[in-house]
Interface confidence: low
């Protein structure tokens, strides 16, 4: 009589997670009588996948009716494959007995599961940095298989080269994770900039996944200050303006000091936005030139986004003509009561 053979024709089968896999197995003889069972793995720790006689295997069905007489095809169909299903599957023939005795095993079919990477998540620095400084962005994606994967970084469409990427674990696994850290040098124009992490994998059919982060979350553009005075229609008044330019983010506290003493504090409200995403703001004081003391210095002090204050001072300039307009009896504060102490516009 011909010796029974258990034939598993494919050495390996590769499927995408969520799909079904067919594992083929045929036997060459109907004798000796006894069941076929499917296992994942070999040796004492192997896992029973399918046993026709007993057990509940909701995701496994036989391709043909195994109860049919003269059936020699014991191929199985596993539905809704996940990366955890990866491994080598063995079709094993048993001789009927009490208990059944293992007679012969197929050579095994390795099931590899192609799993899509998760949407890349890009995280930026926890604290803001100023232009010319380097910040790091991290991109993570998980759950993919096989291990081969390509990750690229872009800033505003331009590919970056300063990054380091690791794929874990290094050895064999049902699925893998990738983590990459890119270093980006900030510029003053980066408020509207975006970094993109792009992940390409065999499961994505040429349509890579992208994760993004806005540099607006990572950048602080400190303001530049300018203080100047302009005459007003009333000959004994001048307008002293503090122009705060090109700052980001919006959080800003402005304090006016007169000869070093705080005269007024205000929070930036009506800001104008520049094309590059930074903001401008101006605050002004109406100053009564008749109430001046010699050598009045007005200082505009700005605290931006919780950083140490920066300031710009201006020595009040009063012309001889303005002095002539003042009567000898004029007295009062330098800051004119004819208007709110500060304004914004």
């Amino acid at each position: 009589e011909e010796e029974l053979q258990v034939i598993q024709p494919e050495k390996s089968v590769s499927v995408t997670a969520g799909e079904s896999a067919t594992l083929n197995c045929t036997v060459t003889s109907l004798i000796p009588v006894g069941p076929i069972q499917w296992f994942r793995g070999a040796g004492p720790g192997r896992e029973l996948i399918y046993n026709l006689k007993e057990g509940h295997f909701p995701r496994v069905t036989t391709v043909l009716d195994p109860t049919k007489r003269n059936n020699m095809d014991f191929s199985i169909h596993i539905s809704n494959i996940t990366p955890a299903d990866a491994g080598t599957y063995y079709c094993v023939k048993f001789r009927k007995g009490s208990p059944d005795v293992e007679l012969k095993s197929g050579a095994g079919t390795e099931l590899s599961v192609r799993a899509k990477p998760s949407a890349p998540v890009v995280s930026g620095p926890t604290a803001r940095a100023t232009p010319e400084h380097t910040v790091s962005f991290t991109c993570e994606s998980h759950g993919f298989s096989p291990r081969d994967i390509t990750l690229k970084w872009f800033k505003n469409g331009n590919e970056l080269s300063d990054f380091q990427t690791n794929v874990d674990p290094a050895g064999k696994s049902v699925s893998y994770s990738i983590r990459s850290t890119a270093r980006v040098v900030l510029t003053r124009r980066d408020v509207h900039s975006q970094v993109i992490c792009e992940v390409a994998h065999v499961t994505l059919q040429g349509d890579p996944l992208r994760g993004t982060a806005n540099l607006s979350e990572a950048i602080r553009v400190p303001p530049t200050l300018e203080v100047f005075q302009r005459p007003m229609r009333a000959e004994n008044q001048v307008n002293v303006t503090c122009q705060v330019r090109k700052f980001y983010p919006q959080r800003l506290l402005l304090t006016w000091l007169e000869n070093g003493n705080v005269s007024q504090t205000e929070t930036a409200s009506t800001l104008t936005e520049n094309k590059d995403g930074t903001y401008n703001w101006r605050s002004w004081l109406l100053v009564n030139t008749c109430a001046h003391r010699d050598g009045v210095v007005l200082t505009c002090q700005v605290e931006h986004d919780g950083q140490p204050a920066v300031s710009k001072s201006h020595a009040l300039e009063v012309s001889a003509h303005q002095k002539e307009q003042c009567s000898d009896t004029t007295s009062g504060p330098v800051l004119a009561p004819t208007a709110p102490l500060g304004g914004s516009g």
Partner: antibody, heavy 122, light 112 residues
Framework: QVQLQESGPGLVRPSETLSLTCTVS????????WSWIRQPPGKGLEWIGF???????FYNPSLKSRVTISLDMSINQFSLKMTSVTAADTAVYYC????????????????WGQGTTVTVSS | DIVMTQSPLSLPVTPGEPASISCKSS???????????LDWYLQRPGQSPQLLIY???NRASGVPDRFSGSGSGTDFTLKISRVEAEDVGVFYC?????????FGGGTKVEIK
């Protein structure tokens, strides 16, 4: 109470350009995405694209080559232009506001215009 | 693009009875920040769509509490605990995880 009102011609000739405007009243344009969505007769909804208040645009790839969305904050309006229209572009066009929060992303299209019917026919 | 599939296509309902609509996405809408980027909208006959549920389960302002959203990953459900006559119309799910934003084909709810 924010309200949106679409305006533009109801009839456009094939191969010409469709131009629609959405006027935002009762609220600010800042910090929202402003979206265009269309619905062909008897069919479902299709997202055309949106614009953030800072001018950044996002388009549906299937329409990207023909669509431009722009915004004018000074008059609280945003606009849709679609070139080379065909009968397949016949639809009710809606403008809508999409909430967005830092760290969360898109947070629901919470205000819609009443829609304007555009027919493409010669 | 993420494909959104709604079922059933049509749902005849009895006022006062519960109703349920399913929405499945071709990829997970659950992001690493814990939010599920799935919205539900109702378009009543002759009207514009109205936001009912955002982020899978959050009821929009002014929406009655008989509407609830649940689900995570790729499978989402909109439940109406007791259908009222004013609930007739087409319900749409929409993913907001990535552009292009995509809608389900709609489920038409009508009174039996």
């Amino acid at each position: 109470q924010v309200q949106l009102q679409e305006s533009g011609p109801g009839l456009v000739r094939p191969s010409e350009t469709l131009s629609l405007t959405c006027t935002v009243s009762g609220g600010s344009i800042r910090n929202y995405y402003w979206s265009w969505i269309r619905q062909p007769p008897g069919k479902g909804l299709e997202w055309i694209g949106f614009i953030y208040y800072n001018g950044r645009t996002f388009y549906n790839p299937s329409l990207k080559s023909r669509v431009t969305i722009s915004l004018d904050m000074s008059i609280n309006q945003f606009s849709l232009k679609m070139t080379s229209v065909t009968a397949a572009d016949t639809a009710v066009y809606y403008c809508a506001r999409v909430r967005a929060y830092s760290g969360i992303g898109l947070d629901g299209t919470d205000v819609w215009g009443q829609g304007t019917t555009v027919t493409v026919s010669s | 693009d993420i494909v959104m599939t709604q079922s059933p296509l049509s749902l005849p309902v009895t006022p006062g009875e519960p109703a349920s609509i399913s929405c499945k996405s071709s990829q997970s809408l659950l992001y690493s920040n814990g939010y599920a980027y799935l919205d539900w909208y109702l378009q009543r006959p002759g009207q514009s769509p109205q936001l009912l549920i955002y982020q899978g389960s959050n009821r929009a302002s002014g929406v009655p509490d008989r509407f609830s959203g649940s689900g995570s990953g790729t499978d989402f459900t909109l439940k109406i605990s007791r259908v009222e006559a004013e609930d007739v119309g087409v319900f749409y799910c929409m993913q907001a995880l990535q552009t292009p934003l995509t809608f389900g084909g709609g489920t038409k709810v009508e009174i039996k």
